[in-house]
Amino acid sequence: SKLKGPELSLKGTQHVTQAGQTLHLQCRGEAAHQWSLPETVSKESKRLSITKSACGRNGKQFCSTLTLNAAQANHTGFYSCKYLAVPTSKKKETESAIYIFISDTGRPFVEMYSEIPEIIHMTEGRELIIPCRVTSPNITVTLKKFPLDTLIPDGKRVIWDSRKGFIISNATYKEIGLLTCEATVNGHLYKTNYLTHRQTNTIIDVQISTPRPVKLLRGHTLILNCTATTPLNTRVQMTWSYPDEKNKRASVRRRIDQSNSHANIFYSVLTIDKVQNKDKGLYTCRVRSGPSFKSVNTSVHIYDKAFITVKHRKQQVLETVAGKRSYRLSMKVKAFPSPEVVWLKDGLPATEKSARYLTRGYSLIIKDVTEEDAGNYTILLSIKQSNVFKNLTATLIVNVKPQIYEKAVSSFPDPALYPLGSRQILTCTAYGIPRPTIKWCWRPCNHNHSEARYDFCSNNEESFILDPDSNIGNRIESITQRMAIIEGKNKTASTLVVADSRISGIYSCIASNKVGTVGRNISFYITDVPNGFHVNLEKMPTEGEDLKLSCTVNKFLYRDVTWILLRTVNNRTMHYSISKQKMAITKEHSITLNLTIMNVSLEDSGTYACRARNVYTGEEILQKKEVTIRDQEAPYLLRNLSDHTVAISSSTTLDCHANGAPEPQITWFKNNHKIQQEPGIILGPGSSTLFIERVTEEDEGVYHCKATNQKGSVESSAYLTVQGTSDKSNLE
């Protein structure tokens, strides 16, 4: 016969009872049955009792009485009674339900979210329920989109159901926000709040937060943590696939972190206790949200026991260069679990030796490499708990680019000058690893005799490699090389000896090794002028004479030669240019600038200076000459001639020293006849001295000298007596 459904003692679809009262509800049926209650009513609660009994005619029916003492507002909901073990296809006839409102004037809403809004996920175009169900069916509820908008139920798009809340049949983005259900009971306003989030299917990121690949010893626990990051309004399903999935080897724990105000973070943690070899392989974490899908995988390696293998990455001897910002010394290591790493340099812990040594994984990083970093490096690898130890040594050679020491210590701002014809020794001392070779080169200077430019020595000229037999440039005496220990380092000193300095140019010593090449240029400028700069005054002139000054400078060291006159006006020294370089005479090694002032007067006295500019420093150099023009003065004799006697055949000197300005011209007369220089009669400097060799009788007579200049003349005379007879008279 057809089974009749269970009957409840309260008729109708709903019933209202007051909070604090006892709810009695009986179920009568033709089979054994059970109660289904609102989630808030715990079957273990002391308030609740369910008593079963046989009832009806002949006790053939099943009765069950539910008693809920001191019913509370949150006990509002569906109470149903259904038969046990009846096919679900006949559900309608096997279950009876009633919705019971537990009315509480102080609590109009069954679930109150006043402080923290309840989050509701919505999908546009779908039904959205704002679940502000009430404890009494006749409570008036208003739905507001906070704070200003009211959503009015229209029976179509917005429907009010006191058992469910507000049903929005076709939700749009306009319903996103803070939705508040408001009810006023006995003059009190009650609110319950909901935050609607648009459900999206965006998966921002998926990661397995374990290093890849994962390595484990057999028997240990594998833990893999998969993290999915999504926007706040996304939910995801996370699944794992792994090698021994069919035997359900793994346990998976899930949790969600919603503490971040911008994103949700979902965690899925896979754990396998006591891993075996069969657990090795690919582990994949799959994340799905609606149509969106992302996955990430990692490999798991299982090892039977701890091990270390270490090999040289390239060769056993390594090379680097001093000055390198960073050098990585690394070995090829395979090990599990990760060993402790210590690097030794020449047997001592490297990182203790210098702060420039850093350990990174299986590498030693040397910062700012210096030649002191050369040596033997040993990597010590140890897995102490398993008593596994390995070490390996590599040799590091630090090559050094050549350095020329004279280049570093040279304090000359401009080139040295080498005297013409001198012997010179040039030296270059070089250091580098490997030991550098040193060669010498010669580059002649460019002689430019055009007036527009000064001579110069540039790098444009062709360079010649020298050897001791070279006949290019200056004659070379020798090129020698020797080793010398300087500052504790084995350095190479190369010496070039120039036998005869004649040609200006540039000598270069070039030190080379496999790291690089360095050169030192030695400007070899020949000078025929002392110190490369010389001023000469022919003689101090007298009024009316010519002033003749010359200035000679080394042509490779100086340019812009000018004569200037220094005059002091109002305590200020003024420079007056009186001659220019274009008047200069360029010779092989020097430039000479002559200055001639004709027919000088006293006003031409003063300080004359030769000015030239140093080609290398740009500095102007002055060499001064004080010139005092003398007044004209009539001649006067310092001593008059006096008579004297001289023996025949001997020699005699007559002096006629006169002063005057300009310097007087001396003329000699004998017996009023002008004396000319002839054999046996010598006129000394300026004709002031008359020297007679092997006096004869004919030399006797009146001698007189006359000193003459523009201002006048002065005379003096004396008689020369020749004593004794000549050979001729003796013969007679």
Epitope: E115, L148, D149, T150, G177, L178, K191
Partner: antibody, heavy 119, light 111 residues
Framework: EVQLLESGGGSVQPGGSLRLSCTAS????????MNWVRQAPGKGLDWVSS?????????YHVDSVKGRFTISRDNSKNTLYLQMNSLRAEDTAIYYC???????????WGQGTTVTVSS | QSVLTQPPSASGTPGQRVTISCSGS????????VNWYQQIPGTAPKLLIY???QRPSGVPDRFSGSKSGTSASLAISGLQSDDEADYYC???????????FGGGTKLTVLG
Amino acid sequence: EVQLLESGGGSVQPGGSLRLSCTASGFNFEDYGMNWVRQAPGKGLDWVSSINRNGDISTYHVDSVKGRFTISRDNSKNTLYLQMNSLRAEDTAIYYCTKNHDYHGMDVWGQGTTVTVSS
Amino acid sequence: QSVLTQPPSASGTPGQRVTISCSGSRSNIGNNFVNWYQQIPGTAPKLLIYLNSQRPSGVPDRFSGSKSGTSASLAISGLQSDDEADYYCASWDDSLNGWVFGGGTKLTVLG
């Protein structure tokens, strides 16, 4: 970029009128409630008026301006208005236009327009 | 006189934690959510906290809000010199049918 730009401020004598405008950009204007908030010189913030999304159901005003000020909006022009009549000296302030946040509060503020009422 | 009550001033040294209180009544804070605004002198206010404790994006997590009954508070930890500003609490008021603000608290960062 979400922006609100107020205009229409100025000096007026007591009893006079002014109309403030606020032009919105960078968001869907018709989907948000809007407000006017003022700040008297050296004083705190005071709410003046609010209007709901459509401008057809709800407008709210602080008691001190009721009957004198009217808030309105033109969604087609993305503009919010405040018509101020019978102005008093105590209405002197910077007037800020603000947008309601989806989840409560005023999340966007204009730079303000100054209204000075003095004889 | 403001509907919500705030202390007129607060101060702290850099790195310190400072708390600003805001008290109201059932019709505002008691029944509604609290927002906090920061106003740096000469600029428009900026939303700092909404829904009692939520931070808009871009607001550092040094700022936190809480509510209990008819009172709310704003806490600023690891105080920085650029936190010097006026802070206002606000809530909807069901009786007045409008927004209500606190009188503002001037925060000074010392030293």
